[in-house]
């Protein structure tokens, strides 16, 4: 079993300064660890490139909304 206590933490130290088209994005994950200096989003593109982005920016929030809705599979 992996040792979760000593698992490496991924952090973002710089954010992209260009808006990425949602058509290029495949997924995202949030960096919420208190061990990281910045609250961040890591987008994964359709060519598997990972890009750090600032969750305070509206285009980042809109892109997360877009990707969330793509996962929508009603189970109710």
């Amino acid at each position: 079993q992996p040792d979760a206590i000593n698992a490496p933490v991924t952090c973002c130290y710089n954010f992209t300064n260009r808006k990425i088209s949602v058509q290029r994005l495949a997924s995202y994950r949030r960096i919420t660890s208190s061990k990281c200096p910045k609250e961040a989003v890591i987008f994964k593109t359709i060519v598997a490139k990972e890009i750090c982005a600032d969750p305070k920016q509206k285009w980042v929030q809109d892109s997360m909304d877009h990707l969330d809705k793509q996962t929508q599979t009603p189970k109710t």
Epitope: Y28, V60, D62, D65, T71
Partner: nanobody
Amino acid sequence: EVQLVESGGGLVQAGGSLRLSCAASGRTFSSYRMGWFRQAPEKEREFVAVISRSGGSTFYSNSVKGRFTISRDNAKNTVYLQMNSLKPEDTAVYYCAAGAQMGWAEASTYDYWGQGTQVTVSS
């Protein structure tokens, strides 16, 4: 960290209304998808409603669709659940949650949870 505090629960008669509020503090509220879930005694926690970061998209469980309305005010860091035409089967503890990871209605994609507020609907 995001701290979530629910309020507005209580005892109401069947057919009545309640408005739940969830006040968030901590990190950037507008960067989180917000959801409401509920848990009745002896039952598993179930999804109720979700609203996107922009507030432009919402989704409801079939059991509350047409009766409940989720909304948010990003300026006030608050999400609401307006509950109308309440039924005894709506009795539960209602939880507000902030979704950090990619998803929609799945509880596992919500990183932050409030302590819950009790809603009791009497017949």
